[in-house]
Amino acid sequence: IWELKKDVYVVELDWYPDAPGEMVVLTCDTPEEDGITWTLDQSSEVLGSGKTLTIQVKEFGDAGQYTCHKGGEVLSHSLLLLHKKEDGIWSTDILKDQKEPKNKTFLRCEAKNYSGRFTCWWLTTISTDLTFSVKSSRGSSDPQGVTCGAATLSAERVRGDNKEYEYSVECQEDSACPAAEESLPIEVMVDAVHKLKYENYTSSFFIRDIIKPDPPKNLQLKPLKNSRQVEVSWEYPDTWSTPHSYFSLTFCVQVQGKSKREKKDRVFTDKTSATVICRKNASISVRAQDRYYSSSWSEWASVPCS
Amino acid sequence: RNLPVATPDPGMFPCLHHSQNLLRAVSNMLQKARQTLEFYPCTSEEIDHEDITKDKTSTVEACLPLELTKNESCLNSRETSFITNGSCLASRKTSFMMALCLSSIYEDLKMYQVEFKTMNAKLLMDPKRQIFLDQNMLAVIDELMQALNFNSETVPQKSSLEEPDFYKTKIKLCILLHAFRIRAVTIDRVMSYLNAS
């Protein structure tokens, strides 16, 4: 058993049929010695008396809020949560496996630039009685500070018969140099509590590996004389690290019709303009990627050909 | 430690071209190592990230773009105080800071060159003949060093008398390649910045 926060404790249980469970001793936080009784949750049934209560925790029915009283007055609470371990593996029931970039990916993180600011998100099908808390650091043995905000519900979407909820959090490394060469990864730890179930999820990454620039901005078209070709130009996104001559981007320009079958055009360039063939009803899209370290491409920025 | 006397090439473009070739060669070599050594811990997640130039060169600090010198977090080493004091960076070409930056890059390349050559000598003794260093990568390191055009005393190649542990050597190769790729990215960024200045 260990303390998650004040008056909240996590009991780690090996979860299998007829498991013996864990013996837990609760102590009432009071100077009083006599006349103390214990109850669980909303029940008025007295579980025991005395300053300490010894219980055998085997299942979720044994978890919950234990309260010690004296003469009708509440003295203190202890909330017991369960953390299940099945076949040596901690349970991951609360969050959904996003399977990208690999299986068992529960947390996904992205950074728009090298400033040390990043966003992580996760998915769940659970809508109520759910809380998250997020901690982060650079390295684990001698951790350097990373400050994370509160996790918030950022999107809801329907997937078949199920509703899916996306939560996200923003974090900022306390003293980040955009030009630094990372040798210690960022560690992100998410504590998830659903009713009386506790789970924890972690992710470890270098900022350079989670870079995903914002889409290029200010796409403009200039038709070329006597030709179906157009010159398309754009600018670096405002959120990208500066100076741009040091933090350079490379771009992919694509012309795509409404249907997959339609003819396309595609060209890669390090410049902020390109010449492509523009076709009626097609659209021109441009995306960006770090020129020197191939992490993710940005989303597309698009304009219609006409 | 005496920095080599600088005679930087006034035309940055050859260096930019060579640094792009360097990054490409290192990335290819790393990819080849990851494929060939698939049963060794050779991915970014599996290895310890070590920097053989740590405390010996200061490329990131010495080559910091002017715009980042206002960022306190980037100024954690003594050498960088030159940047904030000196207005010499305005002219850029053959400035003291640029010479310091390029000589630091040169020293990095020299250290990695020695490490890679020593390692290749060991790998050539491996009866499995599983992996060797790409000669193209070694050639590209050499070309960039020549383009940087510094005069510096040669570092003797380390020779080892004991029987090499090939497993450890291959893991060290992965560690070296990962670190060198990150340094090659920095070098490419620096050359691109200097070329634009």
Epitope: T250, E262, D265, R266, T269 | -
Partner: antibody, heavy 118, light 107 residues
Framework: EVQLQQSGAEFVRSGASVKLSCTAS????????IHWVKQRPEQVLDWIGW????????EYAPRFQDKATMTADTSSNTAYLHLSSLTSEDTAVYYC???????????WGQGTTLTVSS | DIVLSQSPATLSVTPGDSVSLSCRAS??????LHWYQQKSHESPRLLIK???QSISGIPSRFSGSGSGTDFTLSINSVETEDFGMYFC?????????FGAGTKLELK
């Protein structure tokens, strides 16, 4: 399966003109750009240009601007290359190439050999 | 026009060898480089598009790398069916241009 049937070998005299054809099956030429590529006897490849059969719009390499004319007939799924004022320099194999993009060549016909004699 | 220089002009190898063919552009073409193989008395066929993107039906022993001005086609363990001409082609701008080719022949 995509098949490109190019017209047979041509032997023509210097100064004459010739029209080569390329009929596609397994794809609709309207959905592709049709490129034409010349391969001289010493194996050098030269891009002549492309045509969009859907609207007849075409782009030529500058050096073939006055030499080549590309056309297409979507009803017969056939593209044509007309070469004029022929000289021995035009002796080559000519390939038609439908491409999803106007940038590279997904498919190659079997080629038509053109021999220009003086 | 963008000029592509291929080297070497001829490469003599034994089946089982691994080889690298080079293509250099007269100016930066980013990743807009494609590779073709032409066997004797056959039409060319596309091997690799946009520097490193594989083409369905092409054996995995063929791979491409590079960007900017320097590009490489690698054949990991050459097979007898791989002998022939190899051409690179740029597509960053029109006119599209080809390299003069590298002949891969049996040693």
């Amino acid at each position: 399966e995509v098949q490109l049937q190019q017209s047979g070998a041509e032997f023509v005299r210097s100064g004459a003109s010739v029209k080569l054809s390329c009929t596609a099956s397994g794809l609709n030429i309207k959905d592709y750009y049709i490129h034409w590529v010349k391969q001289r006897p010493e194996q050098v490849l030269d891009w002549i240009g492309w045509i969009d059969p859907e609207n007849g719009y075409s782009e030529y390499a500058p050096r073939f601007q006055d030499k080549a004319t590309m056309t297409a007939d979507t009803s017969s799924n056939t593209a044509y290359l007309h070469l004029s004022s022929l000289t021995s320099e035009d002796t080559a194999v000519y390939y038609c190439n439908p491409g999803e993009l106007a940038r590279y060549f997904d498919y190659w016909g079997q080629g038509t050999t053109l021999t220009v004699s003086s | 026009d963008i000029v592509l220089s291929q080297s070497p002009a001829t490469l003599s190898v034994t089946p089982g060898d691994s080889v690298s063919l080079s293509c250099r552009a007269s100016q930066s073409i980013s990743k807009n480089l494609h590779w073709y193989q032409q066997k004797s008395h056959e039409s060319p066929r596309l091997l690799i598009k946009y520097t490193s993107q594989s083409i369905s039906g092409i054996p995995s022993r063929f791979s491409g790398s590079g960007s900017g001005t320097d590009f490489t086609l690698s054949i990991n363990s050459v097979e007898t069916e791989d002998f022939g001409m190899y051409f690179c082609q740029q597509s960053i701008s029109w006119p599209l241009t080809f390299g003069a080719g590298t002949k891969l022949e049996l040693k």
